[in-house]
């Protein structure tokens, strides 16, 4: 590290004064200190000498001595004091720029240390500072306002108490700059147009920053607009707001349009698009498959999507059948609004009864007419059995009935021993009926379907069962021949809560 | 008025570092024109000054012991801490902290007591 | 570094009388600037720190005092104690502090 002669951090001498800063290193070394006039500098050797044979107050500051060549990089410092009693400031810059919140020097170096007791920083013609103006004071740098605000852009004085008596520096100029994060925010309203030929239409582009330098325009379809301008100011903000009239729209004005904003941060646009149509529309569509199937006892949501204009002036769930004359509850339907002119409607069926199988379509209206969409519920069930023993063309036979949705499967078991049910083990003969008869199969409605095991002889110490099955569940009834007649056991009953 | 007081260990072993510390009252070292210094006394010897701080927290060390001497200044706690490593027996001496300000030409006007630290195996 | 060089080491004088203490510096520490020798005279009683006497080799600190004296300039300065009291056996130190490292003299008892 350099060595500078006198080896103290500051030095004061009087106007007039001969001052000779020798600096010493063990290499070459360079002096850096505030522009002021009349230094000389030579070089012998290692060391490295300033000096100047007038010492005014403009030379108050502090030099700094450098060794190029270290690759520690020291340095070593001091500070000189030109004790002028006629002034007591020496201003290094007139004109000080900083972005807001970083900490602003204000360079009024103090030319006689003895003063610092008496400063203070004032605006010009003797104004007091702005309140919550946060500030400190060094002699050798000046003062510092600490976290800049753009409200604190203001000519500045330092005062220095010199005999009773205030004594000003010359004003320095405090240009606080907004920190601008990036290009302009953008607004373009609406984000979606659509208008019947002859109609009125208006799009406004606005867009705002911290600082009042930016561009903003409109175009249509790449052709910037040429829309007056008007601007404002709030909530610490500058506003440029194009608003574009279209008193009776036509095809031609359809397309995109972008509002584009601009500044030294660069450039932000979005865009919207505008639809002229020849008259009102209404459309009604649904994500879902309109025929639906559920299981008894489940939930289920109807959505349908709706894009219309001009807006719907009406709509509805209705239950068209065919248990009951009941129509949903409207505390069951919602809808949402996914942009202007489109929405979501929802019917909400949960824990579904038996009788509210049917159909179900929703109605909506506007200017254009009305449009339905309609969905089909099927419910679910699983099936119920039960078995007669019975004679047909003088023959003994067991009648299975089966019933539930989708149609039953129906298979016979034949097995040893008296049981509600048969298992594997006791299991001596099974036959599958591929095609049980049909009996009822009406829409919205269980199919009950019927299958006949014609038997010569019950054998009494066995067991009958007749099983169906369907993809929901499954359900079945064993039938015990007993010598007094034919005795059946059917399951445990279906318990059905909805 | 002005005091300053070091503490830190009597005995270091050699190899060892020193740390030592200066907690001073009745001035600031973020007024400007003060520095905080540290002077050695070998027993029976002469004064060899060794570093200094400043309130701008420029930091001057005696060339012959710069490569071991670390200085640093906690300006909220009034206290300038010095540390040196490799001790060595010959570094056995009472060590002072001193006050220097612009006032008095930077000469050192406060002293502290001193702390004698002794190194031995 | 420049080297200060006390003279006498040892210094045996009545009370009453005046005692008188050389320096010599190795180089001028004297800056022309301000005319001010960057030198300072110190006091060290057996078991106490240093005292300040004297600054710019002849300023005297407050509080000392006035029979202490500092006088010369560049190269060659003089501690005076114009009339010794008791309490005035002690070392005198001299120090520059002109060019770092600052450095002290020997001391003289």
């Known amino acids: 590290i350099p060595v500078i002669e006198p080896s103290v951090p500051e030095l004061v001498v009087k106007p007039g004064a001969t001052v000779t800063l020798r600096c010493v290193g063990n290499g070459s070394v360079e002096w850096d200190g505030p522009p002021s006039p009349h230094w000389t500098l030579y070089s012998d050797g290692s060391s490295s000498i300033l000096s100047t044979n007038n010492a005014t107050f403009q030379n108050t500051g502090t030099y700094r001595c450098t060794e190029p060549g270290d690759p520690l990089g020291g340095s070593a410092a001091i500070h000189l004091y030109v004790k002028d009693p006629a002034r007591p400031w020496n201003v290094l810059a007139q004109e000080v720029v900083v972005f807001e919140d970083q900490d602003a020097l204000l360079p009024c170096l103090l030319t006689d240390p003895v003063l610092e007791a008496g400063v203070s920083l004032v605006r010009v013609r003797g104004r007091p500072l702005m309140r919550h103006t946060n500030y400190s004071f060094s002699p050798w740098h000046g003062f510092t306002i600490h976290r800049a605000k753009f409200i604190q852009s203001q000519d500045y004085q330092c005062s220095a108490l010199m005999g009773g008596r205030k004594v000003m520096s010359i004003s320095i100029r405090l240009k606080v700059q907004k920190v601008i994060p990036g290009p302009p925010a953008l607004t373009l309203v609406p984000a979606e147009l659509v208008r019947i030929r002859g109609e009125a239409a208006q799009i406004v582009c606005s867009a705002s920053s911290v600082d009042v330098n930016f561009d903003v325009f409109l175009q249509h379809n790449n052709t910037k607009l040429a829309i007056p301008q008007q601007s404002d100011f709030h909530n610490n903000r500058y506003q440029k707001v194009l608003t574009l009239n279209l008193d009776q729209v036509d095809f031609q004005h359809a397309g995109n349009y972008s509002c584009v904003a601009s500044n030294v941060q660069g450039k932000h646009s979005t865009s919207m698009f505008f639809r002229v149509v020849e008259s009102a529309y209404l459309n009604l569509s649904s994500e879902q498959n309109l025929i639906q199937e559920v299981t008894v006892g489940e939930g289920l949501n109807l959505k349908v999507m709706v894009e219309a204009y001009p807006g719907l002036q009406g709509f509805n769930w209705t239950y068209l059948g065919p248990f009951s004359d009941h129509q949903p509850e409207p505390k069951l339907a919602n809808a949402t609004t996914k942009d202007t002119y489109r929405h979501t409607f929802t019917l909400s069926l949960p824990r579904l009864k038996p009788s509210e199988a049917g159909r179900y379509s929703f109605l909506a209206r506007n200017p254009g007419g009305w449009r339905a969409l309609t969905f089909e519920l099927t419910l679910r069930y699983p099936p119920e059995v039960s078995v007669i023993w019975t004679f047909i063309n003088g023959s003994g036979t067991l009648l299975c009935a089966a019933s539930g949705y989708p149609q039953p499967n129906v298979t016979w078991l034949q097995c040893s021993g008296h049981t509600d049910r048969c298992d594997e083990a006791q299991v001596l003969q099974v036959w599958d009926d591929p095609y049980p008869e049909v009996l009822s199969q009406e829409p919205f409605h269980k199919v009950t379907v019927q299958s006949l095991l014609t038997v010569e002889t019950l054998e009494h110490n066995q067991t009958y069962e007749c099983r169906a099955h369907n993809s929901v569940g499954s359900g079945s009834w064993a039938f015990i021949p007993i010598s007094a007649g034919a005795h059946t056991h059917p399951p445990d009953e279906f318990l059905f809560t909805p | 008025q002005i005091t300053l007081k070091e503490s830190g260990p009597t005995l270091v072993k050699p190899t060892q570092t020193l740390t030592l510390t200066c907690t001073f009252s009745?001035?600031?070292?973020?007024?400007?024109?003060?520095?905080v210094g540290w002077i050695r006394q070998p027993p029976g010897k002469a004064l060899e000054w060794l570093a200094l701080?400043?309130?701008?927290?420029?930091?001057r060390y005696s060339p012959s012991l710069k490569s071991r001497l670390t200085i640093t200044k906690d300006t909220s706690k009034n206290q300038v801490v010095l540390t040196m490593t490799n001790m060595d027996p010959v570094d056995t001496a009472t060590y002072y902290c001193?006050?220097?300000?612009?006032?008095?030409?930077?000469?050192?006007?406060?002293w502290g007591q001193g702390t004698l630290v002794s190194v031995s195996s | 570094d420049i080297v200060m060089t006390q003279s006498p080491d040892s210094l045996a004088v009545s009370l009453g009388e005046r005692a008188t203490i050389n320096c010599k510096s190795s180089?001028?520490?004297?800056?022309?600037?301000?005319?001010?020798?960057?030198l300072a005279w110190y006091q060290q009683k057996p078991g106490q720190p240093p005292k300040l006497l004297i600054y710019?080799?002849?300023t005297r600190e407050s509080g000392v005092p006035d029979r202490f004296s500092g006088s010369g300039s560049g190269t060659d300065f003089t501690l005076t104690i114009s009339s010794l009291q008791a309490e005035d056996v002690a070392v005198y130190y001299c120090?520059?502090?002109?060019?770092?490292?600052?450095?002290f003299g020997q001391g003289t008892k």
């Open positions: 001193a006050h220097q300000e612009r006032r008095s030409g930077w000469s050192f006007d406060y």
């Open positions: 009745g001035f600031s070292l973020s007024t400007s024109g003060v520095g």
């Open positions: 701080i400043y309130w701008n927290d420029d930091k």
């Open positions: 180089q001028s520490v004297l800056y022309s600037s301000n005319n001010k020798n960057y």
């Open positions: 710019w080799a002849s």
């Open positions: 120090q520059q502090y002109y060019s770092s490292p600052w450095t």
